[in-house]
């Protein structure tokens, strides 16, 4: 029996559901009798999902996990996994037992959307041109890690005295907070760019400084 | 079983450099994010640098290596690096490599046995 | 930056005896603690993650507890094996990943 997997990660945003897709080429004359099916994470080898015995034994991992019964006969073994969260990535191996066995490794990319980042200034008021600014970007919920990018008005990239720091959540997704600290000319534009490098998703948020008022 | 092997310690002169590596094996290598810890002699613990999964390469670093130190990752060797320019004395220490539990807890699970760099004139 | 405070600085005990080990973070880290053990030339080894939850094949005698700012690791009876320095870090937040200055569990 050969078994065959996507070769490319299936990507699954936060609290969808995602399929694993795994597939067998039956013999003809085969019976459900004759499948052993078993999913299990790759790298602990902790058991996700079992078909023995002529019957599906359910979900072992957190039930949130099916079989698509209807299509086992016809070499569907893939595994449905409900509500996605941060904690299912990483790799899922897929071994099928009829007469003889075959295994097949399918990786699960988890991805979540960041939100518009919201822009501080600090200080708020009386700025005048030559003071030292401290502008923050916050961009929250996402996953994984974003990537974070400043640039002026006339789009150069802003590389220095950048910090940029990570907070996981109890959900394991991220609030990024990046800090750019830059004497102000006349007047200017500061933008910040914050990247889902699953999603290739950019959020931007900028502020711009022209005396009084500012605007976000 | 997860194995962790560094290598590429040893002694310099300060100002110079020095690239460590980290073989591993018994995960899937490219899934987790890494990490450098270093542990001067007789002190504590003190967190380098880390290396998110895939191939993304968002990096970190302690403010006392920023710009000097680089880390990187090859996943098809399954190998960890730490590129440590102008050293300094301050530098010595027992450097280990060390696996996140997963991308979003940065725990360290598997550590390394570590080697030893010294800076001195 | 968050700053881990390890109390005491060395605990005195004889085997057998209950150790209370302490870590405090200067702002709160929810439950993204780690604890760890380091036995003199060796490398550390993770014991607790999730502030509470025991790491793969570490001994029931080893718990941790706290959330928030203040964190216990306690060994309920002291083996030969359990002297060693312990360590307290944080991952809620980063860079950096902070350790706390350790605390050195030693026979009395």
């Known amino acids: 029996v050969e078994v065959q997997v996507s070769e490319d990660p299936v990507v699954a945003l936060v609290d969808t559901d995602a399929t694993l897709r795994c597939s067998f080429s039956p013999e003809p004359g085969f019976s459900l009798a004759q499948l052993n099916l078993i999913w299990q994470l790759t790298d602990t080898k902790q058991l996700v999902h079992s078909f023995t015995e002529g019957r599906d034994q359910g979900s072992a991992y957190s039930n949130r996990t099916a079989l698509f019964p209807d299509l086992l006969v016809q070499g569907n073994a893939s595994l449905r996994l409900q509500r996605v969260r941060v904690t299912d990535e990483g790799s899922y191996t897929c071994f099928v037992s009829i007469q003889d066995f075959d295994s097949a490794a399918v990786s699960l990319q988890v991805a979540a959307p960041y939100s518009k980042p919201s822009m501080t200034l600090e200080p708020n008021k009386d700025l005048r041109p030559g003071n030292m600014v401290t502008i923050t970007c916050s961009s929250y919920q996402g996953y994984p890690e974003a990537e974070v990018f400043w640039k002026d008005g006339q789009g150069v990239p802003l590389t220095g005295n950048v910090t940029t720091s990570q907070m996981a959540n109890e959900r394991g997704l991220f609030d990024v907070h990046s800090v750019l600290r830059v004497v102000l000319g006349a007047n200017g534009t500061y933008s910040c760019l914050v990247r889902n490098p699953v999603l290739q998703q950019d959020a931007h948020g900028s502020v711009t400084i022209t005396g009084q008022p500012l605007t976000f | 079983d997860v194995q962790l092997v560094e290598s590429g310690g040893g002694v310099v002169r300060p100002g110079e450099s020095l690239r460590l590596s980290c073989a591993a094996s018994?995960?899937?290598?490219?899934?987790?994010?890494m990490n450098w810890v270093r542990q001067a002699p007789g002190e504590g613990l003190e967190w380098v640098s880390r290396?998110?999964?895939?191939?993304?390469?968002?990096?970190y670093y302690a403010d006392s290596v920023k710009g000097r130190f680089t880390i990187s990752r090859d996943n098809s060797k399954n190998t960890l690096y730490l590129q440590m320019n102008s050293l300094r004395a301050e530098d010595t220490a027992v450097y280990y490599c060390?696996?996140?539990?997963?991308?979003?807890?940065?725990?360290?699970?598997?550590w390394g046995l570590g080697t030893l760099v010294t800076v001195s004139s | 930056e968050i700053v881990l405070t390890q109390s005491p600085g060395t605990l005195s005990l004889s085997p057998g005896e209950r150790a209370t080990l302490s870590c405090r973070a200067s702002?709160?880290?929810?439950?993204?603690l780690a604890w760890y053990q380091q036995k003199p030339g060796q490398a550390p080894r993770l014991l607790i993650y999730?502030?509470?939850t025991r790491a793969t094949d570490i001994p029931d005698r080893f718990s941790g507890s706290g959330s928030g700012t203040e964190f216990t690791l306690t060994i309920s009876s002291l083996q030969s094996e359990d002297f060693a320095v312990y360590y307290c870090?944080?991952?809620?937040?980063?860079?950096?990943?902070?350790f706390g200055g350790g605390t050195k569990v030693e026979i009395k």
């Open positions: 060390a696996k996140s539990g997963s991308n979003s807890n940065n725990f360290f699970d598997y």
């Open positions: 018994g995960f899937t290598f490219s899934n987790y994010a």
């Open positions: 290396i998110n999964y895939k191939g993304y390469n968002i990096t």
């Open positions: 702002q709160t880290v929810g439950s993204k």
């Open positions: 999730g502030a509470s």
């Open positions: 870090q944080q991952y809620i937040n980063w860079p950096p990943l902070s």
